[in-house]
């Protein structure tokens, strides 16, 4: 029995629903009575749904999943998981028996988009051309892991100087730190751009500096 | 086949410089966070340096070497590089180069070379 | 910097015993959390991440628990091939990615 799912990854947003395809194709005279339809987590082989003796088994996933009973007959055993988590990242084996056996497995990449960056500098005030500055731009509650990129007001990368790091919540979603260390110059502009590698998301913020001496409220 | 095969160990003096390779194959390299774990004679395993997925990507370094070890990766030669300069004899180890078990992230690694030695001595 | 305390050090059973190793971190990394198999001469191997999801292809004799600041790997019945060493390594929050100083399970 072929079974067939997407061979790309489900993309879902967090706290979104998903569907993670998975379709068969029944003989004529296929009946639901004859179907048995397993979804489980291909790692631990943990259930998650299924179907059996013509009859919706529910969910064994914190109920959040479900079936599409109408579409069933025709060959669609596709998943529905409601308020996606990031913990429910991974792959998801399809397992298809009426009087022959088939499986396939889908993989879910859970993605959030990072926060427009908010930007801190320290010092703040009284600065002149020359000084030291500390440029700090974090972003927040996204999944997965970001790139973060400066560049001055020309669009010249600034790869020196620069401290990232990243820490997780317990809903699994990161926040991320950058420094950048800079001296300053008569002016300057200092773009950081926080990058979700999966959304193919940036969240922009920037710090313009401007006058001679430089002061900030 | 996944497989990761580092090169470039040897001996060195104190403050000469090494560039270690892991030629990466049997997976899409420019997907996953890459890392350098070394592990010193009869010590543990100790996280040196990483990097983000993008040509030019994020560098992560740890402490002790910071300022001295460059990480850097050629996405279009599935190749990570690890350019060590001012070596000390604590940087003495065997060096191994991992991929983390999923793509986009930093997390664990499923994937290892076999290691390359790298021993700091006059 | 978050700190990794395995312990034992050192751990002495017989083949079919049940072994417990803890990992202990200094201050919360939730359940991002693996554990590693080490045997001499070779690159370390992923057995749990997660803190309790078995990497593909690994026995399940190899049991993770916990979350927070305290974890268990269990080995339920020691095989031959299981006499090694084994780190933990959390993913919470970095640089750095940090591992802790292991424990070996050797034969009695």
């Known amino acids: 029995l072929e079974v067939q799912v997407p061979e790309d990854p489900v993309v879902a947003l967090v706290g979104t629903d998903a569907t993670l395809c998975c379709s068969f194709s029944p003989e004529p005279g296929f009946s639901l009575a004859q179907l048995n339809l397993i979804w489980q987590l291909t790692d631990t082989k943990q259930l998650v749904h299924s179907f059996a003796e013509g009859q919706d088994q529910g969910s064994a996933y914190a109920n959040r999943t479900a079936l599409f009973p109408d579409l069933l007959a025709q060959g669609n055993a596709s998943l529905r998981l409601q308020r996606v988590r990031v913990a429910d990242e991974g792959s998801f084996t399809c397992f298809v028996s009426i009087r022959d056996f088939g499986s396939a497995a889908v993989s879910l990449q859970v993605a959030a988009p990072y926060s427009k960056p908010s930007m801190t500098l320290e010092p703040n005030k009284d600065l002149r051309p020359g000084d030291t500055v500390t440029i700090t731009c974090s972003s927040y509650r996204g999944y997965p892991e970001a790139e973060v990129f400066w560049q001055d007001g020309q669009g010249v990368p600034l790869t020196g100087n620069v401290t990232t790091s990243q820490m997780a919540n317990e809903q699994g979603l990161f926040d991320v730190h950058s420094v950048l260390r800079v001296v300053l110059g008569a002016n300057g502009t200092y773009s950081c751009l926080v990058r979700n590698p999966v959304l193919q998301q940036d969240a922009h913020g920037s710090v313009t500096i401007t006058g001679q001496p430089m002061t900030f409220p | 086949e996944v497989q990761l095969l580092e090169s470039g160990g040897g001996l060195v003096q104190p403050g000469g410089s090494l560039r270690l390779s892991c030629a990466a194959s049997?997976?899409?390299?420019?997907?996953?966070?890459m890392s350098w774990v070394r592990q010193a004679p009869g010590k543990g395993l100790e996280w040196v340096s990483g990097?983000?997925?993008?040509?030019?990507?994020?560098?992560y370094y740890a402490d002790s070497v910071k300022g001295r070890f460059t990480v850097s990766r050629d996405n279009s030669k599935n190749t990570l590089y690890l350019q060590m300069n001012s070596l000390r004899a604590e940087d003495t180890a065997v060096y191994y180069c991992?991929?983390?078990?999923?793509?986009?992230?930093?997390?664990?690694?499923?994937?290892w070379g076999q290691g390359t030695t790298v021993t700091v001595s006059s | 910097e978050i700190v990794l305390t395995q312990s034992p050090g050192t751990l002495s059973l017989s083949p079919g015993e049940r072994a417990t190793l803890t990992c202990r971190a200094s201050?919360?990394?939730?359940?991002?959390l693996a554990w590693y198999q080490q045997k001499p001469g070779q690159a370390p191997r992923l057995l749990i991440y997660g803190a309790s999801t078995r990497a593909a292809g690994i026995p399940a004799r190899f049991r993770g628990s916990g979350s927070g600041t305290d974890f268990t790997l269990t080995i339920s019945s020691l095989q031959s091939e299981d006499f090694a060493v084994y780190y933990c390594?959390?993913?919470?929050?970095?640089?750095?990615?940090?591992f802790g100083g292991g424990t070996k399970v050797e034969i009695k």
């Open positions: 990097i983000s997925i993008s040509y030019g990507g994020n560098a």
């Open positions: 049997g997976f899409t390299f420019s997907d996953y966070y």
């Open positions: 201050q919360s990394v939730g359940d991002f």
């Open positions: 991992g991929r983390d078990r999923s793509p986009y992230q930093y997390r664990s690694m499923d994937v």
């Open positions: 390594q959390q993913y919470k929050n970095w640089p750095p990615l940090t």
